[in-house]
């Protein structure tokens, strides 16, 4: 058993049918010695008397808010949460496996640049009685500071019969140098509590590996005289690290017909313009990627050919 | 400690092409190592990230773009002095700081070159003959060093009398390649910045 926060305790249980559970001793936070009784949640049934209460915690029915009273007055509370260990592996019931980029990916994180700011998000099908708390650091043995905000509900989607909820959090490394070569990964730890179930999820990454630039901005077409060709031009996104000659991007330009089946013409360039043939009803899209470290491509920025 | 935004003559910067070749070569070598050594801990998540140039060179600090010198997190107190007569510096007006930066890059390349050659000698003794260093990568390191053209003491290749532990050598190869790829990215960024300056 360990303390999650004041008066909230997590009991770790080896989770299998008929498991013996864990013996837990609760102590009433009071100078009083006599006439103390204990109850669980809203029940008025007295579970025991005395300054301490010994319980065998086996299942969720044994978890909850234990209260000690004296003569109708509440003295203190202890909330017990359960953390299930199933065959040596901590349970992951609360969050959905996003399976990208690999199985058992519960937290996904992205950064728009090298400033040390990043966003993480996760999915769940649970809509109520759910709380999250996020901590982060650079490295784990001698951790350096990363400050995270509060997790917020950022999106709701319908997936088949289920509603899916996306939560996200923004974090910022306290003293980040965009040009630095990372040798210690960023660690992100999310505590999740659903009713009386506690789970924790972690992700470890280098900022360089989670970079995903914003799409190029100011995408424009300039028709070339007496030709089906157009000059496409664009600019670096505002959110990208500067100077751009140091933090350079490379670009992919795509001409896509109306039908998805039509052949896509693609050009790769380090410049911020390209000459392409604009077909009728086609659209031109441009996306960006770090020129020197191949992390994710940005989403496409698009304009119609007409 | 940082790079001034100078305006050198166009096309004065032969090192850019070499640095791009270097990044391509080390990335290919790392990919090959990860595939060949699939039963070894060779992914970024599994290895310890060690920098063999730590406390010996200060490339990131010496080559910091002028725009980032206002960022206190980028200013490290480490200062190292280097010899300053590189041929990438085609203009006499090029500052001392730029020379310091390129000299630091040269020292990095020299250290990695020695490590890779020593390692390759060990890998050639492996009866499994599982993996060797790509000669193209070693050649590209050499080309960039020649383009930088700094006079520097030659570092003798390390020789080891004891029987090599091939498992450890292969893991060390992965660690070195990961670190060298990160340094090659920095070198490419620096060359791109200098080319645009």
């Amino acid at each position: 058993i360990w303390e999650l926060k004041k008066d909230v305790y997590v009991v770790e249980l080896d989770w299998y049918p008929d498991a013996p559970g864990e013996m837990v001793v609760l102590t009433c936070d009071t100078p009083e010695e006599d006439g103390i009784t204990w109850t669980l949640d809203q029940s008025s049934e007295v579970l025991g008397s005395g300054k301490t209460l010994t319980i065998q915690v086996k299942e969720f029915g044994d978890a909850g808010q234990y209260t000690c009273h004296k003569g109708g007055e509440v003295l203190s509370h202890s909330l017990l949460l359960l953390h299930k260990k199933e065959d040596g592996i901590w349970s992951t019931d609360i969050l959905k496996d996003q399976k990208e980029p690999k199985n058992k990916t519960f937290l996904r994180c992205e950064a728009k640049n090298y400033s040390g700011r990043f966003t993480c998000w996760w999915l769940t099908t649970i809509s109520t009685d759910l709380t999250f708390s996020v901590k982060s650091s650079r490295g784990s043995s001698d951790p350096q500071g990363v400050t995270c905000g509060a997790a917020t509900l950022s999106a709701e989607r319908v997936r088949g019969d289920n509603k899916e909820y996306e939560y996200s959090v923004e974090c910022q490394e306290d003293s980040a140098c965009p040009a630095a070569e990372e040798s210690l990964p960023i660690e992100v730890m999310v505590d999740a509590v659903h009713k009386l179930k506690y789970e924790n999820y972690t992700s470890s990454f280098f900022i360089r590996d989670i970079i995903k630039p914003d799409p190029p901005k100011n995408l424009q077409l300039k028709p070339l005289k007496n030709s089906r060709q157009v000059e496409v031009s664009w600019e670096y996104p505002d959110t990208w690290s500067t100077p751009h000659s140091y933090f350079s991007l490379t670009f992919c330009v795509q001409v896509q017909g109306k039908s998805k089946r039509e052949k896509k013409d693609r050009v790769f360039t380090d410049k911020t313009s390209a000459t392409v043939i604009c077909r009728k009803n086609a659209s031109i899209s441009v996306r960006a990627q770090d020129r020197y470290y191949s992390s994710s491509w940005s989403e496409w920025a698009s304009v119609p050919c007409s | 400690r940082n790079l001034p935004v100078a305006t050198p003559d166009p096309g004065m910067f032969p090192c850019l092409h070499h640095s791009q070749n270097l990044l391509r070569a080390v990335s290919n070598m790392l990919q090959k190592a990860r595939q060949t050594l699939e039963f070894y801990p060779c992914t970024s998540e599994e290895i310890d990230h060690e920098d063999i140039t730590k406390d010996k060179t200060s490339t990131v600090e010496a080559c910091l773009p002028l725009e980032l010198t206002k960022n206190e997190s980028c200013l490290n107190s480490r200062e190292t002095s280097f010899i300053t007569n590189g041929s990438c510096l085609a203009s006499r007006k090029t500052s001392f700081m730029m020379a310091l930066c390129l000299s630091s890059i040269y020292e990095d390349l020299k250290m990695y070159q020695v490590e890779f050659k020593t390692m390759n000698a060990k890998l050639l003794m492996d009866p499994k003959r599982q993996i060797f260093l790509d000669q193209n990568m070693l050649a590209v390191i050499d080309e960039l060093m020649q383009a930088l053209n700094f006079n520097s003491e030659t570092v003798p290749q390390k020789s080891s009398l004891e029987e090599p532990d091939f498992y450890k050598t292969k893991i060390k190869l992965c660690i070195l390649l990961h670190a060298f790829r990160i340094r090659a990215v920095t070198i490419d960024r620096v060359m791109s910045y200098l080319n645009a300056s």
Partner: antibody, heavy 115, light 112 residues
């Protein structure tokens, strides 16, 4: 004490269907994940499928994906394995089993796929 | 499809020490705990060892398990006639958990 009693096995022709049941007692069935494991005659153990405690997630071995469906009825304390498009290579003793560091197995039920 | 490799058979005379190896990789045994099962003919498997080296109550202390790196082993010290059975190791794989990964199985024969 914990008990898993299996039923539903038998002889079936290739291409036909069969549903296996596993009735649980002696524990809070709705709190635990469950597996199906099979063993072809004279062969080793092969995992078939897993279902979470609340039925929200199901996982299958590649060899049965798209043909077998694992399900559970927590109100009836029963685990099921619906097997469709049966093949000769599905012939085996099928076991249900609880998920956890200490596990409990059903007695096994024989499924024979033969024309 | 078996990723955990066991010797097909091992044998020993009563009282001898018998060991069974279970060889895997970084993504399975290297990352997860190992269980060992005993299966007597015509019966369901019985758990002998969980968590690499833990014995459930009721399992004789002549059975012991250990794990090192990407391999595990089961030792029977002072093997007895009633130990003649098939033995299976089991773990998980990082990429496919909660799918159970079983070893190929080892037939233990007690001679004499």
């Amino acid at each position: 004490q914990v008990q898993l009693v299996q039923s539903g096995g038998g002889v079936v022709q290739p291409g036909r269907s069969l549903r296996l049941s596993c009735a649980a007692s002696g524990f809070t069935f709705s709190s635990y994940g469950m597996h199906w494991v099979r063993q072809a005659p004279g062969k080793g153990l092969e995992w078939v499928a897993f279902i979470r405690y609340d039925g929200s997630n199901k996982y299958y071995a590649d060899s049965v994906k798209g043909r077998f469906t694992i399900s559970r009825d927590n109100s009836k304390n029963t685990l099921y394995l619906q097997m469709k498009s049966l093949r000769a290579e599905d012939t085996a003793v099928y076991y249900c089993k609880t998920h956890g560091s200490h596990d409990n197995w059903g007695q096994g039920t024989m499924v024979t796929v033969s024309s | 499809s078996y990723v955990l490799t066991q010797p097909p058979s091992v044998s020993g005379t009563p009282g001898q020490r018998v060991t069974i190896s279970c060889s895997g990789g970084r993504s399975n045994i290297g990352s997860h705990t190992v269980k060992w099962y005993q299966q007597l003919p015509g019966t369901a498997p019985k758990l002998l060892i969980y968590g690499n080296d833990q014995r459930p109550s009721g399992v004789p202390d002549r059975f012991s398990g250990s794990k090192s790196g990407t391999s595990a082993s089961l030792a029977i010290t002072g093997v007895q006639a009633e130990d003649e059975a098939d033995y299976y190791c089991q773990s998980y794989d990082r990429g496919t958990h909660p799918a159970l990964l079983f070893g190929t199985g080892t037939k233990v024969t007690v001679l004499g």
